[in-house]
């Protein structure tokens, strides 16, 4: 068979699998006269032999790990042993078989990890080697955790990067590891060759001992700082510490205060920089941040709480420059005249703001001094000695000392002596009749004017009239405002009227004075009036309990799952029927009676989340009024979209023949949600048969480079299958095809004779 197993002397390359006993010749070289014999030199290793007649063969199994390429030379000799042709290079490439097991560099590894370390951040690497060809699956290693001890609640705290051997914490490990509970863990790690994919793979194991160290980056206890400190500032009040020295500390004032009286030094000590004033601000909450030397936060900020402790630095203050009270001239001893309420800005319910009252002067002292007394702690003024007479002294002025434990303040009180309250208010009408209103009458509307008169001294508490509704309005839907000059009462709507709960209300008003009546005088029927409020029905639409209902479900919930519910009530008490509007994707159905919402089709976050529909509540019977509310269904992502190419890559070409290995870059994407750092795709060739011609290498989480391994490509289109794995839970893989054409080029573009197939590649490499 000329060509495959025999032929003339020329440079040739042969590929032979290692480990196989010789079963056939490599090549039969044909001699061209005057050549009669052949000679073999080079890296024969006493394995390769050429017979004088030109038969090249090998006499025992090859070992790629000893020599992966044998560079031989064959020369043709004449009858005198003189080289007449060659020597020509003959290359024997030894192809790999999986005849070596992976071995860990260490039988035991030790490492430490800090509690609350960032998930996925490597803290230890295990490393194995395999003498087989790393460009083939035989030398491609796959690491996994066989067991974690102890295993608490079946939760893995550690994870390993299958390719690099990097060990890091899982999210659960980051949250739950605690050296106080479990200071050490042991992992058994396995490594397999064949990328872990074959039953025939070799493996090895190693042990990893992990110490969990305490995370000292913790919020300190709340600090109490006394206000108005006279000590030299700054004063250290607390501290934070990163787990290593050299962190760059800063404070963040979330409240954006005009003055922020705290600082932090490079050791993490926190200071108050100036005296604090509790009355200005009684507590501060701010954050301590630790950054690395590159300016990146090392961890979450810590919340610092500072409570400002009160000192007695505020005197009592009077409620007004002069406080005015009235007293009737025949009031009895002990009657209350009024209460002086002074204030103190110091902390409530402490000795610093606890006030004492004392009368220090009365003018005039007629008919005698000491006519009034004040309750020491309550500030209530009382008549102490006798009744007063308006014609003798119509007005008294008191000076009252108000004191806390350190300060004294003088307050001034004016007491006006007024006529006795011996006249009661009298309504001009005892019955204001019936009033009919629709239940939707506006709040704030005045619906009735009432009037009573009082013959006591004008513009005093004895003649002033206050109106109260004492019956018929337990819901407090109505109120009465009084005009202080005319004592006219205006009845207003304070809350919505409601036919359904109060169609008819029999309202009773009472007219009273703020001043007490003299002994023996009582309010009688003249001080009472009534009216009847009739509320007419307005048919109202059902009312939803919320404007927007929101629910959250995973996008992969089973059909028929309850995903939410809505509730509405009809003011008239009619039954309600629920329906959906705007369910454009046909994903949902609603139970007409209960308002429960169910999925009726597969949900898909990638089609849009939240999914917004309207829910309609309609009266059953009556005038069938309806209301509309929103239902927003937030779909939580599951990894249900395999990676794909980010764009159309038709038209990729290399100019043939290749002068050097070439490469092209492609981008992958998928439609799932990628929080924080974006996708983390891994790339590999889609089938083993591509390994000899192509290589794919990751650039970052979304981009990879496809490179040729050699330059010996035919002038045709190659379809390169690429496997893209998203590393999700569960991991999804997409197999995509990149069509790459090797073509003759004219001025850097593919040349196609006229009439050749369409679809000319347009992207040169």
């Amino acid at each position: 068979q000329e060509g495959k197993f025999s032929g003339p002397l020329k440079p040739m390359t042969f590929s032979i699998y290692e480990g196989q006993e010789p079963s056939q010749i490599i090549f039969q070289f044909k001699a061209n006269p005057p050549a009669v014999t052949f000679e073999l030199t080079g890296e024969t290793d006493n394995i390769f032999v050429i017979e004088r007649e030109g038969l090249l063969y090998y006499n025992r199994a090859l070992d790629r790990e000893t020599r992966s390429t044998h560079n031989l030379q064959v020369a043709a000799l004449d009858a005198n042993g003189i080289i007449v042709e060659g020597p020509v290079p003959i290359t024997i490439k030894v192809k790999d078989i999986n005849d070596n097991r992976p071995t860990f560099l260490q039988s035991k590894y030790e490492g430490s990890v800090r509690q609350n370390s960032r998930p996925g951040k490597p803290f230890l690497y295990v490393n194995a080697t395999d003498l087989d060809d790393p460009a083939t699956p035989n030398g491609q290693l796959y690491y996994q955790i066989v067991i974690q001890l102890p295993m608490i609640n079946n939760v893995m705290y550690f994870q390993i990067n299958n390719k690099t051997g990097a060990i890091s914490l899982t999210r659960e490990g980051s949250q739950e590891l605690n050296p106080a509970k479990n200071p050490s863990y042991n992992l058994v790690i396995s490594v397999k060759d064949m990328g872990g994919q074959s039953e025939n793979s070799f493996s090895d194991t190693t042990s990893v001992d992990i110490i969990v160290t305490e995370n000292i980056w913790k919020a300190p206890k709340p600090v109490e700082m006394v206000e108005n400190s006279t000590d030299p500032h700054p004063i250290k009040i607390t501290q934070v510490r990163w787990n290593d020295p050299g962190a760059q500390y800063s404070l963040v004032d979330k409240e954006k205060l005009p003055r922020f009286p705290f600082s932090i030094d490079q050791e993490g000590d926190i200071y108050v920089t100036q005296p604090l004033d509790r009355e200005e601000k009684d507590a501060y909450v701010f954050y301590a941040v630790a950054k690395d030397e590159y300016g990146k936060p090392l961890s979450y900020p810590l919340e610092i709480h500072v409570k400002v402790k009160d000192i007695n630095d505020n005197p009592p203050t009077c409620p007004s420059p002069v406080t005015v009270f009235e007293v009737q001239e025949n009031e009895r001893l002990g009657n209350s005249i009024g209460t002086l309420t002074a204030h103190d800005r110091d902390e409530e319910n402490t000795a610093n703001s606890f006030l004492n009252y004392r009368i220090v002067e009365q003018t005039p002292k007629l008919p005698m001094d000491g006519l009034f007394l004040i309750q020491t702690y309550a500030g209530m003024l009382q008549l102490a000695k006798q009744s007063l007479k308006k014609q003798d002294t119509p007005q008294y002025n008191l000076t009252i000392e108000v004191s806390d434990k350190d300060f004294k303040t003088l307050c001034f009180v004016q007491i006006n002596v007024i006529d006795i309250n011996d006249q009661i208010p009298i309504f001009e009408k005892s019955d204001y009749g019936n009033l009919t209103l629709a239940e939707d009458t506006n709040i704030g509307s005045t619906i009735l004017t009432i009037q009573a008169t009082d013959a006591d001294e004008p513009f005093t508490g004895s003649s002033k009239i206050l109106y109260h509704i004492i019956k018929g309005d337990s819901e407090g839907r109505l109120g009465v405002d009084t005009d202080p000059h005319t004592n006219t009462g205006y009845v207003i709507i304070k809350k919505p009227l409601d036919f359904e709960t109060a169609a008819v209300s029999n309202i009773v008003f009472k007219a009273e004075n703020p001043e007490p009546l003299v002994f023996g005088v009582k309010y009688n029927a003249s001080s009472f009036a009534k009216f009847t409020l009739i509320v007419t029905d307005v048919n109202e639409a059902p009312q939803f309990s919320q404007h927007v209902f929101q629910a959250k479900v995973s996008e992969d919930v089973a059909i028929g799952t309850k995903v939410g519910n809505v509730t509405a009530k009809d003011p008239e008490g009619l039954d309600i029927s629920y329906s959906l509007r705007g369910d454009t994707r046909g994903w949902l159905k609603i139970d007409h009676v209960t308002g429960e919402i169910f999925s009726v089709a597969p949900l898909d976050r990638e089609a849009g989340s939240p999914y917004r529909v309207q829910v309609v509540a309609t009266e059953v019977g009556g005038s069938s009024l309806s209301s509309v509310s929103e239902f927003h269904l937030i779909l939580m992502d599951v990894n249900d979209n395999p990676p794909r190419l980010a764009k159309d890559y038709t038209g990729l070409f290399f100019c043939h023949p290749l002068s050097a290995p070439g490469s092209l870059i492609f981008e992958a994407t998928d439609d799932d949600q990628h929080l924080f750092r974006g996708p983390h795709f891994t790339f590999s060739l889609g089938s083993g048969s591509l390994q000899n011609d192509w290589e794919v290498s990751k650039i970052n989480g979304t981009h990879a480079r496809l490179s040729t391994r050699h330059t010996e490509f035919e002038e045709r289109e190659y379809v390169v299958l690429i496997r893209i794995n998203d590393g999700g839970r569960p991991p999804l893989e997409g197999i995509v095809s990149l069509p790459v054409t090797f073509c003759s080029c004219v001025e850097g573009s593919c040349f196609r004779p006229a009439g050749h197939q369409t679809g000319i590649p347009t992207v040169g490499m």
């Epitope: 951040k121 690497y125 690099t164 787990n243 290593d244 020295p245 050299g246 690395d292 590159y294």
Partner: antibody, heavy 119, light 112 residues
Framework: AVQLQQSGPELLKPGASVKISCKAS????????MHWVKQSHGKSLEWIGG????????SYNETFKDKATLTVDKSSNTAYMELRSLTSEDSAVYYC????????????WGQGTSVTVSS | DIVMSQSPSSLTVSVGEKVTMSCKSS????????????LAWYQQKPGQSPKLLIS???TRESGVPDRFTGSGSGTDFTLTISSVKAEDLADYYC????????FGGGTKLEIK
């Protein structure tokens, strides 16, 4: 095995700039920070600065802030240091060295790049 | 900045002898929050780049012979070679990594 392969020696004129490279292999480039150290002939070591390859954040010795600029190219696992406005004082061997994130020593060093500044 | 001082600047010993070299820092390198000392020792043989010998003041790196011992606390540190071999001819540098990084001036070890 971890390797830090630095670019070759440089002979430059005063006032020139130079960019030396350090190609990392045998480990995950973004899992370690890369630092640069100067050693003048017969002298001790001086820390110049470091860079976080993940996002390019830098940290400099104040002495070198106006002299050196550190950058990385994640796609080629290579760190660079550019030295500007060169004088004879800048003649030295410059080393790159990796440090795990945090406060750790320099566990692997490049072979060094000799920079000679001469008119 | 933390300043590191080494002494002596050079010393000459015979093979088999014990040698100690000193390193002082201008401030304590002990971080009280975790009780770690942020000091390393490096060996630089002629024509080579520095090699990490000891971290955390006393932890030998893997592959470093046990004749090398680091000790000290706070501000005063010592590197001891219990029985010098010819291959130990090198410059030895201490370095703090407590805040940024600074090296000592070095100690040149020569063999008689």
């Amino acid at each position: 095995a971890v390797q830090l392969q630095q670019s070759g020696p440089e002979l430059l004129k005063p006032g020139a700039s130079v960019k030396i490279s350090c190609k990392a292999s045998g480990y995950t480039f973004t899992d370690y920070t890369m630092h640069w150290v100067k050693q003048s002939h017969g002298k001790s070591l001086e820390w110049i600065g470091g860079i976080n390859p993940n996002y390019g954040g830098t940290s400099y010795n104040e002495t070198f802030k106006d002299k050196a600029t550190l950058t990385v190219d994640k796609s080629s696992n290579t760190a660079y240091m550019e030295l500007r406005s060169l004088t004879s004082e800048d003649s030295a061997v410059y080393y790159c060295a990796r440090i795990p994130y945090g406060s750790y020593p320099m566990d692997y060093w490049g072979q060094g790049t000799s920079v000679t500044v001469s008119s | 900045d933390i300043v590191m001082s080494q002494s002596p600047s050079s010393l000459t010993v015979s093979v088999g002898e014990k040698v100690t070299m000193s390193c002082k820092s201008s401030q304590s390198l002990l971080y009280s929050s975790n009780q770690k000392i942020y000091l390393a020792w490096y060996q630089q043989k002629p024509g080579q780049s520095p090699k990490l010998l000891i971290s955390w003041a006393s932890t030998r790196e893997s592959g470093v012979p046990d004749r090398f011992t680091g000790s000290g606390s706070g501000t005063d540190f010592t590197l001891t070679i219990s029985s010098v071999k010819a291959e130990d001819l090198a410059d030895y540098y201490c370095q703090q990594y407590y805040r940024y990084r600074t090296f000592g001036g070095g100690t040149k070890l020569e063999i008689k």
